[in-house]
Interface confidence: low
């Protein structure tokens, strides 16, 4: 079953159009914007989600960086080119023929150029640092409880294998979630850390991508964990290539 059979919807992606025209009359769902058939038993790729988002009304987007090569998605939304598997194409261009190279999470990793720009390969983002600040609470959360709850959240809601949640750091009110996933570690069927991070980012912003579910109600020992700021840093297997003028 690729989608909820009774009313033919996609539990993991509300930005889809579904109809019972799959094999044997089964429900089949296609992503808005691209028309690509999606597997509703797992997360939809970030590329297809961004493409679907660009076909809908627009919304605006963004403590310590892991190192000098960490990227933050400061460019905001764009209408990406996705490959047949739903991954970002290594080179992205806009309608004015301005092009740039992206990593596996779709974040720009080179200066912008023209149509002659070459992006030889899609460079994998293997380390994601999600930096959160929670709203004030009566006291600090117990680190062990917080760690367990966030690990469980990534497994249950985003279906990310626990081995890819490398660490959860906490210094009130800052929480840092480290996701690590090398190319060699990612097996067929494993959720990509970039997709899990994107779903989480949308959840904490109150823009859940899941069909028919309420927003994320995250609690630690019954105490609500309300996020008031999110920053996500991306580290690639190969450092990004920016000219010095961008760094000054």
């Amino acid at each position: 079953h690729t989608a909820a059979q009774d009313n033919c919807t996609c539990p993991t992606n509300k930005m889809t159009v579904c109809s019972p025209d799959g094999p044997g009359g089964r429900c089949q769902c296609r992503a808005l914007g691209s028309g690509v058939a999606v597997d509703c038993s797992t997360l939809t790729s970030k590329c297809l989600l961004l493409k679907a988002r660009m076909s809908a009304p627009k919304n605006a987007r963004t403590l310590v960086r892991p190192n000098e090569h960490a990227l933050v998605d400061n460019d905001g939304l764009y209408d990406p080119d996705c490959d047949p598997e739903g991954r970002f194409k290594a080179r992205q261009c806009n309608q004015t023929s301005v092009c740039w190279c992206v990593n596996s999470v779709g974040v720009r990793r080179t200066d912008k150029g023209d149509l002659s720009l070459r992006c030889d390969e899609l460079v994998r983002t293997h380390h994601i640092l999600i930096d959160l600040r929670h709203r004030p609470t009566a006291g600090a959360f117990n680190h062990s409880d917080l760690d367990a709850e966030l690990r469980r959240l990534f497994r249950e809601r985003y279906r990310l294998h626990p081995k890819f949640v490398a660490a959860v750091h906490y210094e009130q009110p800052t929480i840092q979630i480290e996701l690590r996933q090398n190319t060699s570690q990612k097996a067929a069927g494993d959720v990509d850390i970039g997709d899990a991070a994107y779903y989480f980012e949308r959840d904490v912003k109150g823009e859940s991508l899941f069909q028919g579910r309420g927003g994320l109600d995250l609690r630690v020992r019954g105490e609500p964990l309300q996020v008031e700021r999110t920053l996500i840093y991306y580290l690639d297997e190969i450092p990004p290539k920016f000219s010095m003028k961008r760094l000054t």
């Epitope: 038993s41 367990a148 690990r151 469980r152 959240l153 249950e156 626990p162 069927g189």
Partner: antibody, heavy 123, light 107 residues
Framework: AVTLDESGGGLQTPGGALSLVCKGS????????MGWVRQAPGKGLEYVAA???????GYGAAVKGRATISKDTGQSTVRLQLNNLRAEDTATYYC?????????????????WGHGTEVIVSS | ALALTQPSSVSANPGETVEITCSGG????????YGWYQQKAPGSAPVTVI????KRPSNIPSRFSGSTSGSTNTLTITGVQADDEAIYFC???????FGAGTTLTVL
């Protein structure tokens, strides 16, 4: 190959205490949740207790308050202590390994079972 | 505790495809998780055929598969064999309960 060997079963007296031990081998013991599931004669499976890789614990309703689950990572063993035994505790007790480490709520995650040890509570 | 619902019995001829459903598990962050456990005879050790909805232990044949639609999980045995005759229990995450078992008879 993963193997789970239970010991400690046998005839027990009502009101007494029981200690079951499960020794695991063939996997990194410290990385996975472990637990106990029992089956009374002619009945279905019933969750008893589990302990996560981080040592958080969970207990089934029928044994809550009477059971304690613990583990010795160095010895690759998990122990179930069950006090105030009742006739309805009579069952085959299976040691079961989770495919994951992070939670003691694990009944959907069991990927390996022991052969079981029989416990009879009778006077 | 939540009660899991599964049929008490199903039957199939060798080579046919059989589906056993399980529903009623508790959700966690809106998702549902089930496992399937095969027991050839009462008192014999169960064997995991599917865990965590879809995962199959390496020693289990590929004819066993699991899928989830909403809150219902389905164990599918494609090309059922005489050796598959057993009781199949489903188990649910969070509620930590098992179903009463489904007896599969291979005709």
């Amino acid at each position: 190959a993963v193997t789970l060997d239970e010991s400690g079963g046998g005839l027990q007296t009502p009101g007494g205490a029981l200690s079951l031990v499960c020794k695991g081998s063939g996997f990194t013991f410290s990385s996975y949740a472990m637990g106990w599931v029992r089956q009374a004669p002619g009945k279905g499976l019933e969750y008893v207790a589990a302990i996560s890789s981080g040592s958080s614990t969970g207990y089934g309703a029928a044994v809550k308050g009477r059971a304690t689950i613990s583990k010795d990572t160095g010895q690759s063993t998990v122990r179930l202590q069950l006090n105030n035994l009742r006739a309805e505790d009579t069952a085959t007790y299976y040691c079961a390994k989770s495919g994951y480490g992070g939670s003691a709520s694990y009944v959907s995650d069991i990927d390996a079972w022991g052969h079981g040890t029989e416990v009879i509570v009778s006077s | 505790a939540l009660a899991l619902t599964q049929p008490s019995s199903v039957s199939a001829n060798p080579g046919e495809t059989v589906e056993i459903t399980c529903s009623g598990g508790g959700d966690y962050y809106g998702t549902y998780y089930y496992g399937w456990y095969q027991q050839k005879a009462p008192g014999s050790a169960p064997v995991t055929v599917i865990y965590d909805n879809t995962k199959r232990p390496s020693n289990i044949p590929s004819r066993f598969s699991g899928s989830t639609s909403g809150s219902t999980n389905t164990l599918t045995i494609t090309g059922v064999q005489a050796d598959d005759e057993a009781i199949y229990f489903c188990g649910s995450y969070k509620s930590n309960t098992f179903g009463a078992g489904t007896t599969l008879t291979v005709l």
